[in-house]
């Protein structure tokens, strides 16, 4: 059976993303998210 370890050599990159709230609605200010492995999670 294959054994999967957290430190098996795969590196997960994360990056902060900033969007303007008014691009998606009427609010002002910035929306800050986090992209992990190509997926925005927050």
């Amino acid at each position: 059976d294959a054994e999967f370890r957290h430190d098996s050599g795969y590196e997960v990159h994360h990056q902060k993303l900033v969007f303007f709230a008014e691009d998606v609605g009427s609010n002002k200010g910035a929306i800050i998210g986090l992209m992990v492995g190509g997926v925005v999670i927050a």
């Epitope: 969007f19 303007f20 008014e22 691009d23």
Partner: nanobody, 124 residues
Framework: EVQLVESGGGLVQAGGSLRLSCVAS????????MGWFRQAPGKEREFVAA????????YYTDSVKGRFTISRDSSKNTVYLQMNSLKPEDTADYYC?????????????????WGQGTQVTVSS
């Protein structure tokens, strides 16, 4: 043809001020969030500040908060970067860029159009 033309750079002593301007042509100005980036010698280009399409929202990198102010004048298709309390570490080429609304404003790759840059040198 889309053009972004920066001006206002120069040599200034530490503690001084400069105002950069960027005139946009060939695009629908109201459809684009506008940003300023900078690139110091030997370093990667980095985000400085951005302003929303309406001008109602702004965002700054931590190192310039309270010192730099971004603004825009839609009647002149121009975006400005007022830089106060300049430091030697602000020395760089400064670039104006345009990103379609909905883009992540702090990522270089999200910006569709770029100017040629204007040089800012802060001496100690």
């Amino acid at each position: 043809e889309v053009q972004l033309v920066e001006s206002g750079g120069g040599l200034v002593q530490a503690g001084g001020s400069l105002r950069l301007s960027c005139v946009a042509s060939g695009l629908t100005f109201s459809s684009y969030n506008m940003g300023w980036f900078r690139q110091a010698p030997g370093k990667e280009r980095e985000f400085v500040a951005a302003i929303s399409r309406s001008g109602g929202s702004t965002y700054y990198t931590d190192s310039v908060k309270g010192r730099f102010t971004i603004s825009r004048d839609s009647s002149k298709n121009t975006v400005y970067l007022q830089m106060n309390s300049l430091k030697p570490e602000d020395t760089a080429d400064y670039y104006c860029a345009a990103a379609l609304f909905g883009s992540a404003i702090n990522l270089l790759s999200e910006y569709r159009y770029w100017g040629q840059g204007t040089q800012v040198t802060v001496s100690s």
